[in-house]
């Protein structure tokens, strides 16, 4: 059987703060817990949830939570149920409500020395007590002529005079707190000789030079006085006008006239009404001058066909607030159909290519007129003019590939190259009219091209094969002067290219046949062992059946390599001693010797006093420095090729001897004794 | 002992609702949940919901809400499931039980033109 | 909701053996699985709830094992009379879900 331990009970509440309504069954098995409501299943809300088998509350609504809760459990596998003891919340609570006139019916209805009543709706539980307040006074009972009742929510006076009137509010409290009136009752009752309002001015707008009129009436027994003053609180009458007011009249019904109204009439009107007794009753108006600023410019727009598009007009400012239209063509635009006007905004719906145009923004009030043009472009899909087509084109020379559109706006053509966009540099330019020149066809420009034409609307592409058309040409072209080391193997290589692969043959310079000893293999020009008589001018001839045929001047020079017959020797000499570094070189033609030392070639003819290079190649340092320390290089050249080598000079303090060093004593290091 | 005697077969047209009984005796009828389920080849099955016969709420799966509508008549110990707007996936016996203990008979429902 | 998933949905046996029948849930449902034998003509009988606790009346060689998604029904020494449809079917929440369902017959 199913047994609650803990079961639900009663208990007060306060609106809007958490509760709880606790169960907790014990059952053999898995029990079902549920909550009913006046015996309808309560569903979780964020505000009400079950929390284990209580029932939690996050905050107590008095009309939601008000009713009788019971906790249901139910054992699935018998299906008995069990349910708890009732419980219900006594919620306390209090709301704000306004003060309204209970009697008489109407505002209208009120007149002195009749009774008023005064209700008020602050509601709660438990029954709050009530206190009345006129003008922030508390109020008590039976004081000034009036009835209070606190237990009551109405205050009632009678009679009710002029001295009543004033601002009535009220508050209440309870046990769950405290709440004042959310709108509160003026009573206003009037004594006949106080200055009452019959017409009061209103704000005028005018345009400059513009006639403005104020309208002011009060009525009291006996008649009040009106009187007009203006900012500088100049009182304004038909005798004495101020003398920015000339054109000022004050009419037997108290409305004020303004003729020609200027800028300096802009501003505060005040018309003044003062019965035998009571307070004066001041009304004011103001005076503005109209004013139109001019309007912000429009960006062209573009836009695509089929789109729905709005252009916003900003009016400008102005007082009073301009009214904005559309206009096309001279025609106001409707605020219906397909373009049309909505609010400020032009409306384009499923736009046509016969939108184009300019549209006019027009903003208008007393002060004038202002216009702004907005042009409207309906972008097209670009058409062909003409494509690119597959083209073939000389090496060396300029080629051109064509991409004539037409479109608008007009398009804009970008050119691809094997799926890569093409930046324009020196070798590439993008005409304006979507031409691509390819300045110095090269070879592997021979691939796809692919240009691209594009508008808002849309875009078109075509791509063409681009076929190079080779020169006939050396690859690489000879070098005109080579040199052959005497007695060894040579090679002399001659290739080229062209649309049909070429022939290539040598020949010597005169004329002659080569000997035997030399074969042309292929464009290969070989030497087994080179002679002194190989030396002389040959010509690579190569030639194809569609070009011809070219040349290519060759000198060959037979030569005795370098050798170094004596190298510099890694040198340590004393500071102030001089240095010597040998060095010799032997080739044909003889070779010329050059010096490097730290870096920078010792030219001979700027050495100085310190410096000198022999004939036969050899450098000597006078007087050598530690800044002279330092890696020193021979190179030897001649026409057919270079050599060099190299060594370190180090240039050291000289030591003190020691007395146990005999005179003869070697140095700790080998030099050169100078 | 506990019985639980449900009504007949039904055949019906589509669109038409039908409204199925079951009679519980040998113990007090307000004292237990009274659950219904369907049975179909398709399905196996599916639990349509429970009816507390004390107060009459119900608590039904989301599945069936809308076409099933659990009644009780405590006065004759008599639990009701009425289907609405009747299709061929429909077509199925449909079982009351009390708790997991006790079951019905069943009720054959075939929907058919 | 839970799914549940039965395992064999058909099995064939001979009497005096022991089978045994799986079901797992799609997300743990503590030990509140219950066990049913549905017959012709007769009305489906509750062997096993609470996924071991056996229902009153029923014989001893029915059994029930298991606990969060994994549950087992075990027949030992079938009897010519259990060979019938067994349904498993999860008592954690609403709505109660079922297997599909396993058919034992005789081989």
């Known amino acids: 059987a199913i047994v609650f331990i803990k079961q639900p009970s009663s208990q007060d509440a306060l609106q809007g703060r958490r509760a709880l309504l606790r169960c907790e069954v014990e059952a053999p098995g898995l029990v079902h817990v549920y909550w009913l409501l006046d015996g309808a299943p309560v569903q979780d809300t964020e505000r009400r949830f079950t929390q284990g088998s209580s029932l939690s509350f996050a905050a107590v609504d008095r009309l939601q939570d008000s009713g009788t809760f019971q906790c249901v459990a139910r054992d699935d596998v018998t299906g008995e149920e069990a349910r708890s003891a009732n419980a219900s919340f006594n919620i306390k609570w209090i709301e704000a409500g306004p003060v309204v006139l209970k009697h008489p019916a109407s505002e209208a209805e009120i007149q002195p020395q009749t009774q008023v009543t005064l209700r008020c709706h602050i509601d709660g539980h438990p029954r709050p007590t009530y206190q009345w307040f006129r003008d922030g006074t508390p109020l008590s009972d039976g004081q000034s002529n009036n009835t209070v009742s606190s237990k009551e929510r109405n205050l009632t006076l009678r009679p009710a005079g002029p001295e009543h009137s004033g601002l009535y509010s009220c508050c209440a409290h309870n046990a769950f707190g405290q709440a004042c009136s959310s709108q509160n009752f003026t009573l206003s009752i009037a004594d006949e000789s106080f200055a009452r309002v019959v017409l009061a001015p209103q704000d005028v707008i005018v345009a400059r030079n513009e006639e403005a009129m104020f309208h002011c009436q009060f009525s009291a027994q006996p008649p009040p006085n009106l009187q007009w003053l203006f900012e500088d609180e100049t009182p304004i009458t038909n005798r004495s006008r101020p003398p920015h007011l000339r054109r000022a009249t004050v009419f037997a019904n108290g409305s004020l006239l303004l003729t020609q109204v200027r800028p300096r009439n802009a501003g505060v009107y005040r018309c003044i009404g003062q019965g035998q007794r009571g307070p004066p009753v001041i009304l004011e108006a103001t005076l503005h001058l109209a004013e139109i600023e001019d309007m912000p410019l429009f960006e062209p727009r573009v836009f695509t066909a089929g789109s729905e598009e709005r252009v916003t007009c900003l009016p400008p400012k102005g007082l009073p607030e301009p009214s904005v239209w559309w206009e096309h063509a001279g025609v106001r635009l409707p605020t219906h159909g397909r373009v049309y006007q909505k609010g400020h905004e032009l409306v384009l719906a499923s736009i046509a290519e016969s939108d184009a145009g300019v549209y006019t923004c027009h903003a208008a009030n007393l002060a004038g007129q202002r216009r702004q043009d907005v042009n409207i472009t309906v972008a097209t899909v670009p058409t062909w003019l003409k494509k690119p087509q597959d083209s073939q084109l000389e090496e060396g020379k300029p080629g051109y590939l064509h991409c004539l559109t037409q479109a608008t706006p007009k398009p804009t053509v970008v050119w691809y190259r094997n799926q890569m966009l093409i930046s324009e540099d020196s070798r590439f330019e993008v005409f304006k009219n979507g031409t691509l020149r390819i300045n110095n066809v090269e070879v592997y420009d021979g691939t796809w091209y692919r240009c691209v034409s594009s508008t808002p609307a849309g875009s078109i592409e075509a791509q063409a094969r681009v076929q190079v058309l080779e020169k006939l040409k050396f690859t690489p072209p000879p070098q005109p002067q080579q040199c052959m080391e005497f007695d060894k193997e040579a090679t002399v290589p001659c290739s080229a290219t062209g649309r049909e692969k070429p022939t290539i043959k040598w020949e010597r310079a005169d004329g002659s046949s080569l000997p035997e000893w030399v074969t042309d293999n292929a464009g290969t020009l070989h030497f087994a062992r080179v002679t002194r008589d190989d030396a002389g001018n040959y010509t690579c001839i190569a030639s194809n059946g569609p070009q011809g045929q070219i040349r290519a001047h060759v000198q060959l020079t037979v030569a005795v390599f370098i050798t170094f017959k004596v190298e510099p020797e890694r040198t340590t000499v004393y500071q102030g001693h001089t240095a010597l570094l040998q060095c010799e070189a032997q080739g044909d033609p003889k070779p010329l010797i050059q010096w490097k030392g730290k870096d920078r070639i010792l030219d001979p003819t700027k050495l100085g006093p310190r410096m000198h290079i022999f004939q036969n190649g050899s450098l000597v340092i006078h007087d050598v420095a530690p800044e002279d320390s330092g890696r020193y290089t021979c190179i030897a050249g001649n026409s057919c090729n270079i050599k060099h080598t190299e060594a370190p000079l180090y240039v050291v303090d000289k030591p003190v001897p020691e007395e146990s060093e005999g005179p003869g004593s070697p140095p700790p290091y080998k030099m050169i004794q100078t | 002992q506990v019985q639980l005697q449900q009504s007949g077969a039904e055949l019906v047209r589509p669109g038409v609702s039908v409204k199925i009984s079951c009679k519980g005796s040998?113990?007090?009828?307000?004292?237990?949940?009274m659950h219904w389920l369907k049975q179909s080849h398709a399905k196996s099955l599916e639990w349509i919901g429970v009816i507390s016969p004390y107060y009459g709420d119900v608590t039904y799966n989301q599945k069936f809400k809308g076409k099933a509508t659990m009644t009780v008549d405590k006065s004759s110990s008599t639990a009701y499931m009425e289907l609405a707007r009747l299709t061929s996936e429909d077509s199925a016996i449909y079982y009351c039980?009390?708790?997991?203990?006790?079951w019905g008979q069943g009720t054959s429902v075939t929907v058919s033109s | 909701d839970v799914q549940i998933t039965q395992s064999p949905s058909y099995l064939a046996a001979s009497p005096g053996e022991t089978i045994t029948i799986n079901c797992r849930a799609s997300?743990?449902?503590?030990?509140?699985l219950a066990w049913y034998q549905e017959k012709p003509g007769k009305t489906n009988k509750l062997l096993i709830y609470?996924?071991?606790t056996l229902q009153s009346g029923i014989p001893s060689r029915f059994s029930g094992s298991g606990s969060g998604t994994d549950f087992t029904l075990t027949i030992s020494s079938l009897e010519p009379e259990d060979f019938a449809m067994y349904y498993c079917q999860q008592h954690n929440e609403y709505p109660w879900t079922f297997g599909g369902g396993t058919k034992l017959e005789i081989k």
């Open positions: 040998g113990y007090t009828f307000t004292d237990y949940g």
């Open positions: 039980a009390r708790g997991m203990g006790y």
């Open positions: 609470s996924g071991s």
């Open positions: 997300q743990s449902i503590s030990k509140y």
